[in-house]
């Protein structure tokens, strides 16, 4: 039985050319996190592994920075970065927990952070 919940930054928006931090947090479980994957649709952005630390996919190396914590920082944003992002927590013994974040990259300067929400 998986008792944990993933809290994410939810629906967020940011300005073109700027940067944004994607954050997830796993709570309500004593499971041990063994790895966190960050994915954009079906593309792997980065991995944070308990043994090996961070690995950033080569195609994103220039624009993706690890952290803070288990989060991911996206830099030099373009309109093409708009879309769904997923944090995938691999845990023992529970298995996999997934959180979803929707990022909208705006041309104007009216970008505003959305509210937090939870995914069981």
């Amino acid at each position: 039985m998986m008792t944990g919940t993933i809290e994410t930054t939810g629906n967020i928006s940011a300005e073109k050319g700027g940067s944004i931090i994607l954050q997830c947090h796993l709570s309500s479980t004593t499971a041990q996190v063994t790895q966190v994957n960050w994915e954009q649709q079906d593309q792997l952005l980065a991995i944070c592994n308990a043994d090996l630390g961070w690995h950033i996919s080569p195609s994103f190396k220039d624009r993706v920075a690890p952290g803070p914590g288990l989060g991911l920082t996206l830099q030099s944003l373009t309109v093409n970065d708009t879309g769904e992002y997923f944090c995938i927590y691999h845990t023992y013994p529970d298995g996999t927990y997934t959180g979803r974040i929707f990022l909208e990259v705006l041309e104007s300067s009216v970008a505003e952070h959305g509210a937090r929400f939870q995914i069981p």
Epitope: T30, Q32, Q35, V36, C48, Y92
Partner: antibody
């Protein structure tokens, strides 16, 4: 070969302090979550504290009887976990075991041979 | 705190007999977080069963584990001389982690 070697035990007066160390080898220490478990003479096992991996923000958790008095820490560069014990009481007298647990597709659970802490005046 | 109560406290049996050790939790434990340890005099405990039913490396197939919720069991189908020891159940489903008081399996 996996080894966990505890050290730092001994005789200490009530109210005193002691720092235990546990040196690990033979497995990927940075990926292991580490615990201290104790066993009073002739008694059962009691969980004392844990420290998680970097991916788990090196989170620490404690048993009720030691909370606020004991502090667990780790140094991944030295593959060592520590237990700083303050305000020691007679009821803290026990063999203290270091335990390491690791999951990399298979679950592993390793224990040291223990170090004896005696709190007495 | 989840209190684990093991029964019986002592179990006296002969080699070849079947042994059933019970562990009852004061509130529900997720099955992945219920472990059994074996301890012999003067030795550190050894992981015996994890995740309720998975045998640790090197543990003979005569051992099995089962249960869910608040009731868990370790069974030895036919006792061998080396099985006589103290067995502890352990949960890390919620803080603080706890152990049962142990069942001593002794030769009759």
């Amino acid at each position: 070969e996996v080894q966990l070697v505890e050290s730092g035990g001994g005789l200490v007066q009530p109210g005193g302090s002691l720092k235990l160390s546990c040196a690990a080898s033979g497995f990927t220490f940075s990926g292991a979550w580490m615990d201290w478990v104790r066993q009073a003479p002739g008694k059962g096992l009691e969980w004392v504290a844990e420290i998680r991996t970097k991916v788990n923000n090196h989170a620490t958790n404690y048993g009720e009887s030691v909370k606020g008095r004991f502090t667990i820490s780790r140094d991944d560069s030295k593959s060592t976990v520590y237990l700083q014990m303050n305000s020691l009481r007679a009821e803290d007298t026990a063999v203290y075991y270091c335990r390491g647990a690791l999951y990399d597709g298979f679950y592993f659970d390793y224990w040291g041979q223990g170090t004896l802490v005696t709190v007495s005046s | 705190e989840i209190v684990l109560t093991q029964s019986p406290a002592t179990l006296s049996l002969s080699p070849g007999e079947r042994a059933t050790l019970s562990c009852s939790a004061s509130s529900s434990v997720s099955s992945g977080y219920l472990y059994w340890y074996q301890q012999k005099p003067g030795q550190a405990p050894k992981l015996w069963i994890y995740g309720t039913s998975t045998l640790a490396s090197g543990v003979p197939a005569r051992f099995s584990g089962s249960g869910s919720g608040t009731d868990y069991t370790l069974t030895i189908s036919s006792l061998e001389p080396e099985d006589f020891a103290v067995y502890y159940c352990h949960q890390w489903s919620s803080f603080p982690y706890t152990f049962g008081q142990g069942t001593k399996l002794e030769i009759k």
